[in-house]
Amino acid sequence: GQNITARIGEPLVLSCKGAPKKPPQQLEWKLNTGRTEAWKVLSPQGGPWDSVARILPNGSLLLPATGIVDEGTFRCRATNRRGKEVKSNYRVRVYQIPGKPEIVDPASELTASVPNKVGTCVSEGSYPAGTLSWHLDGKLLIPDGKETLVKEETRRHPETGLFTLRSELTVIPTQGGTHPTFSCSFSLGLPRRRPLNTAPIQLRVREPGPPEGIQLLVEPEGGIVAPGGTVTLTCAISAQPPPQVHWIKDGAPLPLAPSPVLLLPEVGHEDEGTYSCVATHPSHGPQESPPVSIRVTETGDEGPAEGSVGESGLGTLA
């Protein structure tokens, strides 16, 4: 038999070998496809199946617009002018080339020694599903599950039967200062079909480096608060990826889950003390912020406070 590939929506003509080019012809076409359960013999007079597969005057079979359900086997049996029976057998596969793949949500830069999501490659409207591959500086990237991680997802459209592929690439660059170029390609896996490539993205890799500084911000400013007030401490750090932040009060670690923000609601005198935050970065040691002092003072002790009498001499309630 002969293997045929036809593009979805395009016509396909299968010739019936041995059939006389003009009537009278002795021939029979039968098909076994997604539209049939077993073999369907087509009527030479034509009929409802003509919209899918029609016998032409020369004995060939025309599929006016091939679809996924037309994949299957087509056979013709003809008697030639000399009375000899000639058989033709075709195995038909269909395909659809998707739109050009795209890298969506690309990273703006990468950080060495830590996992970085490069982006997600998306291909829409293929049949069969095909495959997505990532390339680094023009060379195929083989996922190893450690330095190079690829998360794939394939979805099929319930009506069209066409596939959407998504491939998310995560890498751990070994060193900074480089500018790797990533691209993604889609391949249907059919002979004589070149892969479709995305536009490449070039990313800067920077060393994780010690954070440029760690700051501890306090609200209210100055760290002076009335009893029952709220204090917010924020550990501001410029490192990527964000490090884990722990808190220290009067030299002792606070038993709290790591968080860049420490909230002290309804403060009392027991909350007074010196606070600092410690940022722990995967590739560098812990880094401690300069300390800040929190003081809880009764109204009037340290100048105006909530509900205090201001310069105007009038009582104001915030």
């Epitope: 009527s43 009929g47 409802p48 919209s51």
Partner: antibody
Framework: EVQLVESGGGLVQPGGSLRLSCAAS????????MTWVRQAPGKGLEWVAS????????YYPDSVKDRFTISRDNAKNSLYLQMNSLRAEDTAVYYC????????????WGQGTLVTVSS | DIQMTQSPSSLSASVGDRVTITCRAS??????VNWFQQKPGKAPRRLIY???NLADGVPSRFSGSRSGTDFTLTISSLQPEDFATYYC?????????FGGGTKVEIK
């Protein structure tokens, strides 16, 4: 909304001719086969004719072959049935329906037009 | 030509009854059978297409099944608006052939 509206029915003498029309709207007419089905008074449904989307291929049962001709004008979104050599047994309500092939099997029908063949 | 033998030709039933109508094809027609409902003075309305698929807007009490060349339309719980005539149609080969019809009447 798909709409099919038949016209052209009426009283005709045996041996006479009549041309039925069907105006289609609400779908891309030239993408679909079209079919005529009839129903004699108090009787069941009978297929009369089908035509493919291009109009190049037509199909008839033996009962009307060589007497009836189905045609279409895709530019006008119209379907026609030319009926010649009419007989008393052709008396029926004639329905126009979309489809008639294995891809689109008569999902939409017109309201019908009555043809009476009588002397 | 393919014959579609529909049975029964008529039946009487009450609201809430389960009703079954059968069509037998004289040869293999695959899945290419539809069911239609017709009320007096109205055009037929497609209920089931390709043997088992419910057409848009048709209540789920209607269902179609197939066993070889036998096709069945079932109304699980007959409603007042279901009293009508039902036809099967074979559209696998020309001539397209309808069953003779089944008139469902109020008992």
């Amino acid at each position: 909304e798909v709409q099919l509206v038949e016209s052209g029915g009426g009283l005709v003498q045996p041996g006479g001719s009549l041309r039925l029309s069907c105006a289609a709207s609400g779908f891309t007419f030239n993408n679909y086969w079209m079919t005529w089905v009839r129903q004699a008074p108090g009787k069941g449904l009978e297929w009369v004719a089908s035509i493919d989307n291009s109009g190049d291929n037509t199909y008839y049962p033996d009962s009307v072959k060589d007497r009836f001709t189905i045609s279409r004008d895709n530019a006008k979104n119209s379907l026609y049935l030319q009926m010649n050599s009419l007989r008393a047994e052709d008396t029926a309500v004639y329905y126009c329906a979309r489809g008639g092939d294995i891809l689109d099997s008569l999902p939409y029908w017109g309201q019908g037009t009555l043809v009476t063949v009588s002397s | 030509d393919i014959q579609m033998t529909q049975s029964p030709s008529s039946l009487s039933a009450s609201v809430g009854d389960r009703v079954t109508i059968t069509c037998r094809a004289s040869q293999d027609v695959g899945i290419y059978v539809n069911w239609f409902q017709q009320k007096p003075g109205k055009a037929p309305r497609r209920l089931i297409y390709r043997a088992t698929n419910l057409a848009d807007g048709v209540p789920s009490r209607f269902s179609g099944s197939r066993s070889g060349t036998d096709f069945t339309l079932t109304i699980s719980s007959l409603q007042p608006e279901d009293f009508a005539t039902y036809y099967c149609l074979e559209f696998d080969e020309h001539p397209l052939t309808f069953g003779g019809g089944t008139k469902v009447e109020i008992k």
